[in-house]
């Protein structure tokens, strides 16, 4: 029973495995992986992938089988499959494997990237979308925008990213987001970079504005100098010979 | 979506063999194993056996073993239930039903409409 | 096998009162479904994995339990809902069904 010997495409059909309370989970958190047969079987098996020998054997007269990992630490996170058996099987022939399922056991998730959809300059009432990414699916991401303390919009979601649309008018400001596991216990990923929404006038009416000042001085500066020449031209007409300013 | 139908009501003589039909539409039908129920009138449901069509794997009911034999053709979505040596303790409604098997369901999530036999000389 | 002991057998009720039946397995089971049947028709799943409600169904129905012991409630009845409920296991083979429990208005 120790070697599963790979049975024929379809003969016997996969289960199902899944993890209580999630597939990711902080240190020390105690985790139960339910593997559940579509029929009734005899003995369980929980494999990761690449290994012949079974991590743990259940031997259960049920369509369930469960395994207990207790207080998982990171170095048992990875990818796990089951499998199940019937005796009038024959001896070693067990079911086709489960879908992977992976196991993440960390502190942190890792920080999203937080990108504006088209740009992050945005026309006069034209609608921006911020697309928050992450690595995982199935997670629940947060929207902020500096300068107000409660979270902007919240979305769950079956991607590993999630889109904020906001309103044209209302759209100009720094943004950052995060994502966490959607249910306890909690998994938080680090803030996202932050990023910048700006008018797509108001640049280039800060242009114009800088403009006219500019004129406007350089025409202070000429009208000066003007002063200066008729200035300066007249007093050499009334100056003595040999007499330069 | 989903749907069994079964094959229309039969009439046998004591000691004949009569084979119901159940054809499957909506979904892969190697999937999923397909059960039969029997159902005698005013009874409860009975569990006959169940076939796995990706494969033809087959589990019994002791108590029917040697009366029914549950086969399946993948070409035409068809799962069969052929009664032997009828007896008038035979005449019943006969149920087929989808297994769900998923990791979150694990019923009968969906049935034909029955195919009433009766065994009469 | 496993043997499942549905009671009441018959039992009758008013509309708008809360219904309870129970479902009694001669061993442990990972999970009880319940089927819905009326007269004529073939069986509806209605709950199951022990507390799922079947989509489309009414929010009134709700099951529970765990081991040997199940259980079937209507919060408050209602005429539609009359009709023969049976509990089913697929822990162990043969699979089995209860007995039914018949429920009529009153």
């Known amino acids: 029973d120790i070697t599963p010997s790979v049975p024929p495409a379809s003969y016997h059909p996969k289960p199902w495995l899944g993890a209580q309370p999630a597939t990711v989970v902080t240190p020390g958190v105690n985790v139960t992986l339910r593997c559940r047969a579509p029929q009734p079987a005899w003995r369980f098996g929980l494999f990761k992938p690449g290994e012949i020998a079974p991590l743990l054997f259940r031997d259960v007269s049920s369509e369930l089988a469960e395994f207990f990992l207790e207080e998982v630490t990171p170095a048992q996170g990875g990818s796990y499959r089951c499998c199940y058996r019937r005796p009038d099987w024959g001896p070693g022939v067990w079911s086709q494997p489960s879908d992977v399922l992976e196991l993440l056991v960390t502190e942190e998730l890792p920080r999203p990237s937080l990108v504006a959809l088209p740009g992050p300059v945005v026309g006069p009432g034209a609608n921006v979308s911020l697309r928050c990414a992450g690595r995982l699916r199935n997670m629940s991401f947060v929207l902020y925008r500096e300068g107000v303390a409660a979270p902007l919009q919240y979305r769950h979601s079956a991607q590993p990213w999630a889109d904020f649309t906001l309103l044209g008018a209302r759209a100009p400001g720094t943004y950052s987001c995060y994502y966490h596991t959607p249910s306890a216990p909690y998994v938080l990923s680090q803030r996202s970079e932050v990023l910048v929404i700006s008018w797509e006038d108001s640049g280039s009416s800060d242009y114009t504005r800088g403009n006219l000042v500019r004129l406007g001085l350089a025409g202070l500066v000429l009208i000066s100098l003007g002063a200066l020449v008729t200035f300066d031209w007249r007093s050499q007409n009334r100056a003595p010979a040999g007499i330069r300013p | 979506q989903v749907q069994l139908q079964q094959s229309g009501a039969e009439l046998a003589r004591p000691g004949a063999s009569v084979k119901l039909s159940c054809k499957a539409s909506g979904y892969t039908f190697t999937d999923n194993y397909i059960n039969w129920v029997k159902q005698r009138t005013g009874q409860g449901l009975e569990w006959i056996g169940e076939i796995y069509p990706g494969s033809g794997n087959t589990y019994y009911n002791e108590k029917f073993k040697g009366k029914a034999t549950l086969t399946a053709d993948k070409s035409s979505s068809t799962a069969y239930m052929q009664l032997s040596s009828l007896t008038s303790e035979d005449s019943a409604v006969y149920f087929c039903a989808r297994s769900a098997n998923r990791y979150d369901r694990g019923d009968f999530d969906y049935w034909g409409q029955g195919t009433p036999l009766t065994v009469s000389s | 096998q496993i043997l499942l002991t549905q009671s009441p057998a018959i039992m009758s009720a008013s509309p708008g009162e809360k219904v309870t039946m129970t479902c009694s397995a001669s061993?442990?089971?990972?999970?009880m479904h319940w089927y819905q049947q009326k007269p004529g028709s073939s069986p509806k799943p209605w709950i199951y994995d022990t507390s799922n409600l079947a989509s489309g169904f009414p929010a009134r129905f709700s099951g529970s339990g765990s081991g040997t012991s199940y259980s079937l409630i209507i919060s408050s009845m209602e005429a539609e809902d009359a009709a023969t409920y049976y509990c089913h296991q697929r822990s162990s083979y043969p699979y089995t069904f209860g007995g039914g429990t018949k429920l009529e208005i009153k």
């Open positions: 061993s442990s089971v990972s999970y």
